[in-house]
């Protein structure tokens, strides 16, 4: 049930735009999947320095990509 050949070359080294805008790259299965029920556009790739991961938000909470957002919680999707 994999979604085609798009994948990252290495686990920690993203290839250029490996997924279409409606998709995210799931590291667990190493392929592009639907980003799911996020109600905001997919955020831009994180910068080199990123804050520690945070606990997943509930789906009704905001998941907007603020100026300093690097680690955006996903409501357990996928």
């Amino acid at each position: 049930m994999r979604r085609g050949p798009r994948s990252l070359r290495g686990r920690d080294a993203p290839a250029p735009t490996p997924c279409v805008p409606a998709e995210c790259f799931d590291l667990l299965v190493r392929h592009c999947v639907a980003c799911g029920l996020l109600r905001t556009p997919r955020p831009k790739p994180a910068g080199a320095s990123s804050p520690a991961p945070r606990t997943a938000l509930q789906p009704q909470e905001s998941v907007g990509a603020g100026a300093g957002e690097a680690a955006l919680p996903l409501p357990g999707l996928l």
Epitope: M1, E23, C24, F25, V33, P53, P59, P75, L78
Partner: antibody
Amino acid sequence: EVQLVQSGGGVVQPGRSLRLSCAASGFAFSSYGMHWVRQAPGKCLEWVAVIWYDESNKYYGDSVKGRFTISRDNSRNTLYLQMNSLRDEDTAVYYCARRFTNLRGWIIEDYGLDVWGQGTTVTVSS
Amino acid sequence: EIVLTQSPSSLSASVGDRVTITCRASQSISSYLNWYQQKPGKAPKLLIYAASSLQSGVPSRFSGSGSGTDFTLTISSLQPEDFATYYCQQSYSIPLTFGCGTKVEIK
């Protein structure tokens, strides 16, 4: 309260079938991937299967592939594990659990299983 | 399949002791390592995710460290309710795998 309540375990003969259920409450079930994990008596934890929030992807452990089917009914907030061709070695406590993920940029990271059911016992014996 | 080896398999300790449990992966898993506590007859409980992040509601005496192949769970001051079995689990790739556990017993 976030909760997973399991049912459907029991004693079954080798070769027969059984279906486990896991009823979710207290969270948006349809937004979460879900797992089944099992633990044979006195043994290690063994991952069984995972299903995406929308059923678009399903993966299985090698020991159950082709015999077990994971599914879900988001309208009923319920996860299922259909177990066919049961073997003695399938005897275990079965747990359902919620997938814990984080979105970093456009990359989804997996952080394990953050909510677990109480477990249900499956005994395969003739 | 990524194999996780925990050590020791069991240990005896007293209340107030500092306890360290290690988990070694058969290949590099970056920081995708999680720790669980399980008590007899109960489901596992997530303590630490992403090697070092404390799960919500878990006491701060629990901490995790490591990356690559070697990881550690530390309980800074063992409490009576901490006597249990602890498991590591990798979420680097499918199939998910668990260590076989470290049982922490009362000395």
